[in-house]
């Protein structure tokens, strides 16, 4: 008789999760030779230890500490790109602008990007059927706690001008409940960060509105200003052209507004 298993509202652990994390770690250390000292088996063991045999609604940042101490690396603090609800474009951007970094360009972010995982209390099994949904089940689930922990430290590292890419097609361009709004904004260090520059990405080709005047952007400006960090905002009306101009800045069409 199969043992009763808790049914959660979210999708289960990504298939072949252990193999995927290990393979990504190996690939990352190959792409980044300066990280070749990283022991990927130790990384996986620490990752696994954070959630295996633990109730998936009772995960804490403490659980991830053995993983958090691994993979020390160098990210220029003035080349950090944060993003909210527009991950794909942010990643396309850093793939072209190789000297800028999103969290997913770092080892720990790269390992976990787009993956889901959870275990079960008192068993060493990984739950491939379902995992807790942040809204419907609980916020202290393995995936949410992981991203909260790594995002906080990434934001703490930033200096000078920090950029954030925001999705202008969303009803809340700046969402206080996003990882950016609830974690990263509050962990920028005012003594190191001079300016937060928001890039609001437009969705429609004919959309010529100044989305920097959006009430949620004004809310972001208020939060940032209260933290003694300057705020600036730019509309990116044509994201396709924006990327093209990052690739080919000498192009004559790149002098006009994008």
């Amino acid at each position: 008789v199969p043992r009763w298993r808790q049914q959660w509202s979210g999708p289960g652990t990504t298939k072949r999760f252990p193999e995927t994390v290990l393979a990504r770690c190996v690939k990352y250390t190959e792409i980044h030779p300066e990280m070749r000292h990283v022991d990927c088996q130790s990384v996986w063991d620490a990752f696994k230890g954070a959630f295996i045999s633990k109730h998936p609604c009772n995960i804490t940042e403490e659980d991830y500490q053995p993983l958090m101490k691994l993979g020390t690396q160098t990210v220029p603090c003035n080349k950090i790109l944060l993003w909210s609800r527009i991950k794909d474009l942010a990643h396309q951007f850093t793939q072209v602008q190789r000297d800028m970094f999103t969290l997913e360009d770092t080892l720990l972010g790269y390992l976990a990007d787009d993956l889901t995982w959870c275990g079960e209390f008192n068993t060493s099994k990984i739950n491939y059927q379902s995992c807790p949904d942040w809204r419907k089940d609980c916020s202290n689930n393995p995936v949410s706690v992981f991203w909260k922990t790594v995002s906080r430290r990434f934001a703490e590292a930033a200096c000078d001008v920090v950029h954030v890419m925001l999705n202008g097609s969303r009803s809340k361009i700046f969402d206080k409940n996003s990882t950016f709004g609830s974690v990263e904004v509050h962990n920028l260090q005012p003594e190191k960060v001079q300016t937060l520059e928001a890039w609001v990405i437009h969705g429609g080709r004919e959309d010529s509105r100044d989305l920097c005047q959006d009430p949620t952007i004004k809310e972001l400006e208020s939060i940032i200003s209260k933290r003694n960090i300057q705020f600036s905002c730019k509309n990116i009306y044509r994201p396709d052209k924006f990327l093209q101009c990052v690739k080919n800045p000498e192009d004559s069409s790149c002098t006009s507004e994008i």
Epitope: P33, E34, H37, E61, E62, Q65, P66, M68, K69, T72, Q73, T74, V75, P76, C77, T106, T149, R152, R153, F154, E156, A157, N187, Q189
Partner: antibody
């Protein structure tokens, strides 16, 4: 604002022990290694050891052969460095310093230093 | 253990001079993990440059760093009065950590 505040100067006799504290604030205490570095008068920097408050992991400079003990109190965000069997050559300024995870392990914040004088 | 040797141990220079400090490792070091600190008398060291060439927050752009393998340099393009200090190179490794012996930059 990140701050590391160390305890005050100490004068000790040879053979005694000293315990120096370093209280951290303004960042997530658990997720950064804390290093201890000392500097004898007119000399360079010498690494003593490191502690990771998140899980209590510790690494020591073998030179100190069990004389140094590092501990962390997560409830007060404080790390401690105890050095035993003091000798005159342990007279130095002792620094705690945070290891920057995204700074390639560089020490991005330092305490103000604690002068320990060993004299009979 | 990898040793870090700085040269010169001290140097005298005038305001406006270009100054170069060298740090040589006894075996190869990843450029991502080679750092520099500035220390003034009676003060704690300050992170000055990390990952060979990245300036720490607030460090003036007249400072630059370069190098790979075993040889690294810190350069001040035009020495200013506030730059007179001792500079230490440092190689990150879990254990043991090693610092250079320091280079004292003095006023000529």
């Amino acid at each position: 604002q990140v701050q590391l505040v160390q305890s005050g100067a100490e004068v000790k006799k040879p053979g005694a022990s000293v315990k120096v504290s370093c209280k951290a604030s303004g960042y997530t205490f658990n997720t950064y290694w804390m290093q201890w570095v000392r500097q004898a008068p007119g000399q360079g920097l010498e690494w003593m050891g490191a502690i990771y408050p998140g899980d209590g992991d510790i690494t020591y400079n073998q030179k100190f052969k069990g004389r140094v003990t590092l501990t962390a109190d997560k409830s007060t965000s404080t790390v401690y460095m105890e050095l035993s069997s003091l000798r005159s050559e342990d007279t130095a300024v002792y620094y705690c310093a945070r290891e920057g995870y995204y700074y390639g392990g560089a020490l991005d914040y330092w305490g103000q230093g604690t002068l320990v004088t060993v004299s009979s | 253990d990898i040793q870090m040797t700085q040269s010169p141990s001290s140097l005298s220079a005038s305001v406006g001079d270009r100054v170069t400090i060298t740090c040589t490792a006894s075996s190869s070091v990843s450029s991502s993990y080679l750092h520099w600190y500035q220390q003034k008398p009676g003060k704690a060291p300050k992170l000055w440059m990390y990952g060979t060439s990245n300036l720490a927050s607030g460090v003036p752009s007249r400072f630059s760093g370069s190098g790979s393998g075993t040889d690294y340099t810190l350069t001040i393009s035009s020495l200013q009065p506030e730059d007179f200090a001792t500079y230490y190179c440092h190689r990150y490794h879990r254990s043991p950590w090693t610092f250079g012996q320091g280079t004292k930059v003095e006023i000529k």
